[in-house]
């Protein structure tokens, strides 16, 4: 069956270059036109570039024209996107997508590869407790959490009590701060009566920086 | 370039409902229109091409129609697997423009948020920064307004919000709003409050604390 396997994404500084690859299998590569489409975090789909099956025709979106170059190597069954002079607004998941025969809609898609354009360097998070108190109690239910702050790049994973606690957990999508670093909160609601007896620990893992933090969250002692 | 405009941007519906999404082209594209479905973290999936031709393997509850500049995608009986974001795409011209997307979400019943406020931890204050977090838990619909007040003065530009995806069990959303200040600024003020407005609340709810008090 038709398969498009992408590689080459990663974190890159503004102004630098990156090359994405799209390796095709399950069809005669040299007969098909393949496109690049991207999707910025939380946004819609944006068509980026196309190269015809015979290589004669290349077309680019205005936003990337002059900076991005599409190419293909039929002997390797691979399509490339060379991205130069990268900008923060190029941060997106990039997809390669194959057309159906001669019609220019996208019947087959790659899995996507994330490109992050940022001047930030890899940094592990600081983990701070969001301690339960009378201000975070409502009708027999208490809320507590962890603030996972100032890390780069995405992602971090958060579990509670080594995965034993899942009910009532909300881990929020990360926000990009003006510093270029990410921050997120993970919270859990628990019975107020359990606060004195049950231990609550958030387990934070940031693989890019090899950082693991286990933070015990307890009521503030006054 | 041919511009594609989709409406609505969000559509709330229940399983079994008939739903319709509209896509308009800025100039005629004949029937050169495709529809895609996308779920979080996944690549888009082709549903429909040539405006009304169903892609192989796609259920017949998906119905496409239209030509020229006006197109619709109808789901005749919405099923659980259909809650997703839908995009139209014209392929009449070189620039294969997409619509901005329509998110089909589960229609829940109005639920007011539970509101909690968290002061910055002593650990964080030692680092020179103070984050105050306001949590809105398990509410519907998604629209909620959070306002920060410090010593009763409205804050702007120094907070960030994040909202969860709709909960698969109870259709609700949760939101966190984080007010970030320097330690010096934090220590200049006493009363920190977040005020929440939501359809499920008869009047705004305020949660607050006095700095330095338990």
């Amino acid at each position: 069956q038709v398969q498009l396997v992408q590689s080459g994404g990663g974190v890159v500084q503004p102004g630098r270059s990156l090359r994405l690859s799209c390796a095709a299998s399950g069809f005669t590569f040299s007969r098909y036109t393949i496109h690049w489409v991207r999707q910025a975090p939380g946004k819609g789909l944006e068509w980026v570039a196309v190269m015809s099956y015979n290589g004669n025709n290349k077309h680019y979106a205005d936003s990337v024209n002059g900076r991005f170059t599409i190419s293909r190597n039929d002997s390797k069954n691979t399509l490339y996107l060379n991205m130069n002079s990268l900008r923060p607004e190029d941060t997106a998941v990039y997809y390669c997508a194959r057309i159906r025969d001669t019609a220019m809609f996208f019947a087959h898609w790659g899995q996507g590869t994330l490109v992050t354009v940022s001047s930030a360097s890899t940094k592990g998070p600081s983990v701070f407790p969001l301690a339960p108190s009378s201000k975070s109690t409502s009708g027999g239910t208490a809320a507590l959490g962890c603030l996972v702050k100032d890390y780069f790049p995405e992602p971090v994973t958060v579990s509670w009590n080594s995965g034993a606690l899942t009910s009532g957990v909300h881990t929020f999508p990360a926000v990009l701060q003006s510093s270029g670093l990410y921050s997120l909160s993970s919270v859990v609601t628990v019975p107020s009566s359990s606060l004195g007896t049950q231990t609550y620990i958030c387990n934070v893992n940031h693989k890019p920086s090899n950082t693991k933090v286990d933070k015990k969250v307890e009521p503030k002692s006054c | 370039d041919i511009q594609m405009t989709q409406s609505p941007s969000t559509l709330s519906a229940s399983v079994g409902d008939r739903v319709t999404i509209t896509c308009r082209a800025s100039q005629s594209i004949n029937t050169w229109l495709a529809w895609y479905q996308q779920k979080p973290g996944k690549a888009p999936k082709l549903l429909m091409y040539k405006a009304s031709s169903l892609e192989s393997g796609v259920p017949s509850r998906f119905i496409g129609s239209g030509s020229g500049t006006e197109f619709t995608l109808t789901i005749s009986s919405l099923q659980p697997d259909d809650f997703a974001t839908y995009y139209c795409q014209q392929y009449n011209s070189d620039s294969k423009m997409f619509g901005q997307g329509t998110k089909v979400e589960v229609k829940g019943t109005v639920a007011a948020p539970s509101v909690f406020i968290f002061p910055p931890s002593d650990e964080q204050l030692k680092s020179g920064t103070a984050s105050v977090v306001c949590l809105l838990n398990n509410f519907y619909p998604r629209e909620a307004k959070v306002q920060w007040k410090v010593d009763n003065a409205l804050q702007s530009g120094n907070s960030q919000e994040s909202v969860t995806e709709q909960d698969s069990k109870d259709s609700t959303y949760s939101l966190s709003s984080t007010l970030t200040l320097s330690k010096a600024d934090y220590e200049k003020h006493k009363v920190y409050a977040c005020e929440v407005t939501h359809q499920g609340l008869s009047s705004p709810v305020t949660k607050s604390f006095n700095r330095g008090e338990c």
């Epitope: - | 229940s14 079994g16 005749s76 009986s77 659980p80 829940g108 709709q166």
Partner: nanobody, 118 residues
Framework: QVQLQDSGGGLVQAGGSLRLSCAAS????????VAWFRQVPGKERELVAS????????YIEDSVKGRFTISTDNTKSTIYLQLNALKPEDTAVYYC???????????WGQGTQVTVSS
């Protein structure tokens, strides 16, 4: 949550008919949509037909269109699946299901076996 009791299955000759019933209790019947699924051993449950809360919007999968119909009797809180022109490949356990007002089917009948012999 709603409770569902499905019935009406049996052994029938190819070309024959059956009417499956799904009796609902526990919540106002008009408050939710109901669907019929079927499952062959070793395969996933597949949607066959569904009807919305008001009964004015029905959906029948292509594989059974023209042979199966779904209907509702609000007075009896019952949903029916009429199976006509049955084929051996229609042999399966048939389940009715309802979503608890949410984006998934979380209330299920216990299943009723339909066997079509050639």
């Amino acid at each position: 949550q709603v409770q569902l009791q499905d019935s009406g299955g049996g052994l029938v000759q190819a070309g024959g008919s059956l009417r499956l019933s799904c009796a609902a209790s526990g919540r106002t019947f008009s408050g939710y949509s109901v669907a019929w699924f079927r499952q062959v051993p070793g395969k996933e449950r597949e949607l066959v037909a569904s009807i919305n809360r008001s009964g004015d919007n029905t959906y029948i999968e292509d594989s059974v269109k023209g042979r199966f119909t779904i209907s509702t009797d609000n007075t009896k809180s019952t949903i029916y699946l009429q199976l006509n022109a049955l084929k051996p490949e229609d042999t399966a356990v048939y389940y009715c299901a309802a979503p608890y007002g949410l984006g998934r089917y979380d209330s299920w009948g216990q299943g009723t076996q339909v066997t079509v012999s050639s």
